[in-house]
């Protein structure tokens, strides 16, 4: 892979010196480094009207390196790019730009959304939920005996949480009234609902669920702030009820 010099041979600057600073193999007073020691990258830095050669162990931000047989050279990425694979393909954009297919954009194209952590344009992800689980046994105040009219609940899982612009999740709990033949509670029988039905409450902000309306079946679009307020109100209600030592099945 030896370099075969073309018609335009590069002429050395008249003031070429061998006593060079940090990493330079050859240098001149006027242009700085002209060539580098092995494994170092040669980069031209513009200082005013002058271009100064510098030798570095790796290319600086906004440059990419090419290891030619006779020289390791840094080449500038496009102006809006911080890290690039080559002139055509950016891999990390400068602040304020979003990366999409190797290009840096002010805004993400239609159908994509900006990920403000990675600063990339990503596909919009919509909520996905599982099928409904079977209805729970008919209960009243947490008991399965000693009443005629109670409520039953069914749940479904969130399979895919939505991204910022994705469709919100529909309700994951549904409660309805139920009627059973009254059955006397046996002595000491509390008849509480099975523990396996208890679901861990999602962490704050973990699931983007829409709160159902009074029918408990339709989802409504709402802002994160509204959702946060409702969750706080719900927590307070639950705490109040716990103080009154009444266990009720609620709609999430």
């Amino acid at each position: 892979q030896n370099a075969s010099r073309g018609r335009r041979q590069r002429r050395m600057h008249p003031n070429v010196s061998q006593g060079c600073q940090g990493g330079c193999a050859t240098c001149s007073d006027y242009n700085g480094c002209l060539s580098c020691k092995p494994r170092l990258f040669f980069v031209l830095e513009r200082i005013g009207m002058k271009q100064i050669g510098v030798c570095l162990s790796s290319c600086p931000s906004g440059y990419y390196g090419t290891r030619y047989p006779d020289i390791n050279k840094c080449t500038k990425c496009k102006a809006d790019c911080d890290t690039c694979f080559n002139k055509n393909f950016c891999t990390k954009c400068k602040s304020g730009f979003y990366l999409h297919l190797g290009k840096c954009l002010d805004n993400c194209p239609e159908g994509l959304e900006a990920n403000n952590h990675t600063m990339e344009c990503v596909n919009i992800v919509h909520c996905e939920v599982s099928e409904w689980n079977p209805w729970s046994p008919c209960t009243k105040k947490g008991k399965t005996c000693g009443f005629k009219r109670g409520t039953e609940t069914r749940v479904r899982e969130i399979m895919q949480h939505p991204s910022a612009k994705g469709n919100l999740c529909p309700p994951t709990n549904e409660t309805r009234k139920c009627t059973v033949q009254r059955k006397k509670c046996q002595k000491g029988e509390r008849g509480k609902k099975g523990r396996e039905r208890k679901r861990k409450k999602p962490n704050k902000g973990e699931s983007k669920e829409a709160i159902p309306d009074s029918k408990g079946l339709e989802s409504s679009k709402e802002t994160p702030e509204q959702r946060e307020n409702k969750q706080q109100q719900k927590k307070r209600k639950v705490q109040d009820k716990q103080q009154k030592s009444v266990s009720v099945s609620t709609v999430h």
Epitope: Q1, R7, R8, Q9, R10, R67, Y68, N86, F89, T91
Partner: antibody
Framework: EVQLVESGGGLVQPGRSLKLSCAAS????????MAWVRQAPKKGLEWVAT????????YFGDSVRGRFTVSRDNTKSTLYLQMDSLRSEDTATYYC?????????WGQGVMVTVSS | DIQMTQSPASLSASLGETVSIECLVS??????FVWYQQKSGKSPQLLIY???RLQDGVPSRFSGSGSGTRFSLRISGMQPEDEAEYFC?????????FGAGTKLELK
């Protein structure tokens, strides 16, 4: 739209010469290192030569060094490959490509057959 | 020169099947790695650069992974238009070297 169009291929006898040309359009030719990559019939890809953006340096694969020369005319956005002392093993489709670490743009290729 | 060992040499897959092609490199090249697709009678086209980044227009069923000396190309759900030869290339240093290629056919 980027276009690279090769020409100058054909049938040539061993030991003879051939010059390939590649006309480029749709991108800033003078910004890019340009290369020739070849592919023998039913075989893989082999890098032949690269000339840097300003034409001042060129690099060659072991199998062609000393026999092939590469040049460019940035005013005409054209790349050339001068092939001398051709051998039967030089028989291949020759592709003109923009070489910037990866080979980003490719021409349609031109067939060179070296046979007596 | 950096050696590229690509496997398998050929592969046939059914429609919708997931396929993987691997490339082993003789020295650590970080992620300076590229995949090309060459359809029959056509010139190669850049598919993936920097080991895992898709070129514009490449369907999302294609994905690249790996770093250092081991790289792979995955097609999640083979389509008729994916029938082609695939080549890997190291872009770490001169001379640029290619894998021998993998011919992917539709069963």
């Amino acid at each position: 739209e980027v276009q690279l169009v090769e020409s100058g291929g054909g049938l040539v006898q061993p030991g003879r010469s051939l010059k390939l040309s590649c006309a480029a359009s749709g991108f800033t030719f003078s910004d890019y290192d340009m290369a020739w990559v070849r592919q023998a019939p039913k075989k893989g890809l082999e890098w032949v030569a690269t000339i840097i953006y300003d034409g001042s340096r060129a690099y060659f694969g072991d199998s062609v060094r000393g026999r092939f020369t590469v040049s460019r005319d940035n005013t005409k956005s054209t790349l050339y490959l001068q092939m001398d002392s051709l051998r039967s093993e030089d028989t291949a489709t020759y592709y003109c490509t923009a070489h910037d670490r990866s080979f980003d743009y490719w021409g349609q290729g031109v067939m060179v057959t070296v046979s007596s | 020169d950096i050696q590229m060992t690509q496997s398998p040499a050929s592969l046939s897959a059914s429609l919708g099947e997931t396929v993987s092609i691997e490339c082993l490199v003789s020295e650590d090249i970080s992620n300076d790695f590229v995949w090309y697709q060459q359809k029959s009678g056509k010139s190669p086209q850049l598919l993936i650069y920097a080991a895992s980044r898709l070129q514009d227009g490449v369907p999302s069923r294609f994905s690249g992974s790996g770093s250092g000396t081991r790289f792979s190309l995955r097609i999640s759900g083979m389509q008729p238009e994916d029938e082609a030869e695939y080549f890997c290339q190291q872009s770490y240093k001169y001379p640029p070297t290619f894998g021998a290629g993998t011919k992917l056919e539709l069963k």
